[in-house]
Structure formats: structure tokens, C-alpha cells
């Protein structure tokens, strides 16, 4: 089971936020019927990533990758997913 | 289903104190620059988001966790 497959929509939203990609975020939020106030809240989080620059997105991507590939999550997500997320995080 | 450790990370990012959030990230042997960045992002989110914003973010997360896409 790939890590993103454990909850693909969560990782879609997370990487859209961390990437500073508004279009991608809107697209992901539409899939879960987000309300306007919910969209506004997520865009405020996205602003923090954008203001901190690319390294901020990479570093926080590292946090998510590290936690998602930790022993705590290994029951739900198997090791081979680490490489996938690492590529997503660092290949930007 | 989302991994509980990831859910805990996101919950603390929104509702915890900066110290609580950074301590939680530190449990995963994060690099010093990663911890510093985590604190800066947490402080930024706390400054930008009202309590209502955070409630809206949490309700969105509930939608995500209960979605058929999760």
C-alpha cells in the first residue's frame, strides 16, 4: 500500500498548500466539497508557506515525509512509499 | 485511512502551542533547520488565523478524513 494511497486526498491538499499552488488547492478542495470559509482558512496556511519561500515548502514536506514513513505509520503505510514522497517533496 | 501520527501532527499544527508542535516534530529526529522552519510556520499560522479560521480548517480536515478519497 502506497503512503499516498492511505489517504490520497490528504496528501493532495497538503502538497498543494505547501507548494503554494492555489489552482491545485482549489481543485483538491472541490473534491471534498469545501465551504468558502474552509477554503479561506487553507489559503491562510498556504500564505505562510509562500512567504517563507521554497525551502520552507521543502522542509515542511520533509516533516510530513518523515512522520509518514516513521514506525508510527508503518502499520498503515509500507516503506516503499518513502521514496515516492521524497521525490514529490524534493523534486520541486 | 490517515495515519494517526500524521493526524496528530496536523492537529498540533493548528491547535497546539509552538512549543508543543516543535516538540512533536522533534520526536521524529528532524534536522535542526527543519525544526526551526516548523516553528516559523507555526508562528505564522497562529498570527494569520483566527480561532474561527482554525475551526474551519479542522472541519475541512474532518471532511478529508471521512471522504471516500481517504
Amino acid at each position: 500500500v502506497k503512503m499516498a494511497e492511505t489517504c490520497p486526498i490528504f496528501y493532495d491538499v497538503f502538497f498543494a498548500v505547501a507548494n503554494g499552488n492555489e489552482l491545485l488547492l482549489d481543485l483538491s478542495l472541490t473534491k471534498v466539497n469545501a465551504t468558502e470559509p474552509e477554503r479561506t482558512a487553507m489559503k491562510k496556511i498556504q500564505d505562510c508557506y509562500v512567504e517563507n519561500g521554497l525551502i520552507s515548502r521543502v522542509l515542511d514536506g520533509l516533516v510530513m515525509t518523515t512522520i509518514s514513513s516513521s514506525k508510527d505509520c508503518m502499520g498503515e503505510a509500507v516503506q516503499n512509499t518513502v521514496e515516492d514522497l521524497k521525490l514529490n517533496t524534493l523534486g520541486r | 485511512e490517515i495515519c494517526p501520527a500524521v493526524k496528530r501532527d496536523v492537529d498540533l499544527f493548528l491547535t497546539g502551542t509552538p512549543d508543543e508542535y516543535v516538540e512533536q516534530v522533534a520526536q521524529y529526529k528532524a534536522l535542526p533547520v527543519v525544526l526551526e522552519n516548523a516553528r516559523i510556520l507555526k508562528n505564522c499560522v497562529d498570527a494569520k488565523m483566527t480561532e474561527e479560521d482554525k475551526e474551519n480548517a479542522l472541519s475541512l480536515l474532518d471532511k478529508i478524513y471521512t471522504s471516500p478519497l481517504c
Epitope: N52, G53, L62 | P32, V33
Partner: antibody, heavy 120, light 107 residues
Framework: QVQLQESGPGLVKPSETLSLTCTVS????????WSWIRQPPGKGLEWIGY???????NYNPSLKSRVTISVDTSKNQFSLKLRSVTAADTAVYYC??????????????WGQGTLVTVSS | DIQMTQSPSSLSASVGDRVTITCQAS??????LNWYQQKPGKAPKLLIY???NLETGVPSRFSGSGSGTDFTFTISSLQPEDVATFYC?????????FGQGTKLEIK
């Protein structure tokens, strides 16, 4: 190819301020962390501090009270100021770039170093 | 601060010899350790990152291993151009700290 070049006076008087600049060429200063590291003659390496292009800094506690690192993104430069110098601050000063990945934080590019002597 | 203790401080070996340098951290740093080579009058050069990963373009005779507090750097077959001082560097905690260096000479 990224290149780093330190510049500044090679001789500083005791109690004065040591000022050095690192010019980055062949790449942008943005989106990286940048460090100053020094090496007294015949001795080992000591990390002084780093700066992120946004201006965020972190200093070695042993030097924190005397150090300021700043950045000028328009010139692709970052600078070091070390106040109230003594003979113990005589060293080769290097600037270096951090490369950060999921589990690694290393200095992948270095300047050639500049010797600063503290003497009256 | 995390103290990095490198040994030996100097060593002399013959061309073709296997050379081993150790580095001990005063506390657990996982695998957050790099090795650098510094030739006389030059800036240090990254050889190994993350305790065991060989930097691109670095000859495969160089290798690193270890985790926690004990780390090893090895040159499998010493070459004349390897004359230098080698430093370990921990990045598990701030401030970043270096070992005192190991000066390697050819017999």
C-alpha cells in the same frame, strides 16, 4: 557551477570589527541556507552561523554576542560582522552553502577562504 | 554542544593500505554526520554525507558507516593524492560541530 568568493580586509586591529562579504556566482542566493565557518591557523573548523535568504539567522552560542550575519539578495551576497575582535579571532574564514535533503544537511560549496589576522 | 572526538589525530600509511578513521559523538546524532577532506591551503570538500552516502564525483575507495554515536570513515586503498586532513561534522543539533581532524600522510 556555483562559486563563492570571500572578500574583506586581511588585517583587523584588536577591539575593532571584522567585516567580510561572500559573493555567490553561478547560482541564486535564494532558497538556500548559507554559513560562515572559520579555521584558526593549524587548527580545526568552527561553525560561526548561518543565514537564510529571507534574513533568518542562527549563530553559534560561543560567538552569538559578537556576530551579525546579513544578506543582500539583490547583490547575491551575504556578510559577516564580528565585533570586539582579539588575537583568538585570527583565522581563515570560509563561506559555504548548505545542501539540505530529507536526512542530510551538508556544506556542498565552499569559498576558497580568506585569512584575517587580528593584530595592532 | 555536541562534542566530536576524532581518532587518531594523525596517521601515516603506505599507498594501497586500508585506512580507517573514527569519530565519536558525545550524544546520539542518528546518522547526521558528514566527512570532509581538506588539502593544504584549500577549502574542505564534502566526501560523505548522511554517515554513509558517497558525494557525487567522489572516488568509491572512500566510504563511511555508523550511526548513533560511533562512526567510521574508510579509504579502501590509499592513493598519493589522498594526503589531507579529514574532518567529521555533525548536524544533528545546533551548533554544528566538527571533529578536531585527522592528518593523513604517506609513508
Amino acid at each position: 557551477q556555483v562559486q563563492l568568493q570571500e572578500s574583506g580586509p586581511g588585517l583587523v586591529k584588536p577591539s575593532e570589527t571584522l567585516s567580510l562579504t561572500c559573493t555567490v556566482s553561478g547560482g541564486s542566493i535564494s532558497n538556500y541556507y548559507w554559513s560562515w565557518i572559520r579555521q584558526p591557523p593549524g587548527k580545526g573548523l568552527e561553525w560561526i552561523g548561518y543565514i537564510y535568504y529571507s534574513g533568518r539567522t542562527n549563530y553559534n552560542p560561543s560567538l552569538k554576542s559578537r556576530v551579525t550575519i546579513s544578506v543582500d539578495t539583490s547583490k547575491n551576497q551575504f556578510s559577516l560582522k564580528l565585533r570586539s575582535v582579539t588575537a583568538a579571532d585570527t583565522a581563515v574564514y570560509y563561506c559555504a552553502r548548505h545542501r539540505i535533503t530529507r536526512t542530510a544537511d551538508s556544506f556542498d560549496y565552499w569559498g576558497q577562504g580568506t585569512l584575517v589576522t587580528v593584530s595592532s | 554542544d555536541i562534542q566530536m572526538t576524532q581518532s587518531p589525530s594523525s596517521l601515516s600509511a603506505s599507498v594501497g593500505d586500508r585506512v580507517t578513521i573514527t569519530c565519536q559523538a558525545s550524544q546520539d546524532i542518528t546518522n547526521y554526520l558528514n566527512w570532509y577532506q581538506q588539502k593544504p591551503g584549500k577549502a574542505p570538500k564534502l566526501l560523505i554525507y548522511d554517515a554513509s552516502n558517497l558525494e557525487t564525483g567522489v572516488p568509491s575507495r572512500f566510504s563511511g558507516s555508523g550511526s548513533g554515536t560511533d562512526f567510521t570513515f574508510t579509504i579502501s586503498s590509499l592513493q598519493p593524492e589522498d594526503v589531507a586532513t579529514f574532518y567529521c561534522h555533525q548536524y544533528g543539533d545546533l551548533p554544528y560541530t566538527f571533529g578536531q581532524g585527522t592528518k593523513l600522510e604517506i609513508k
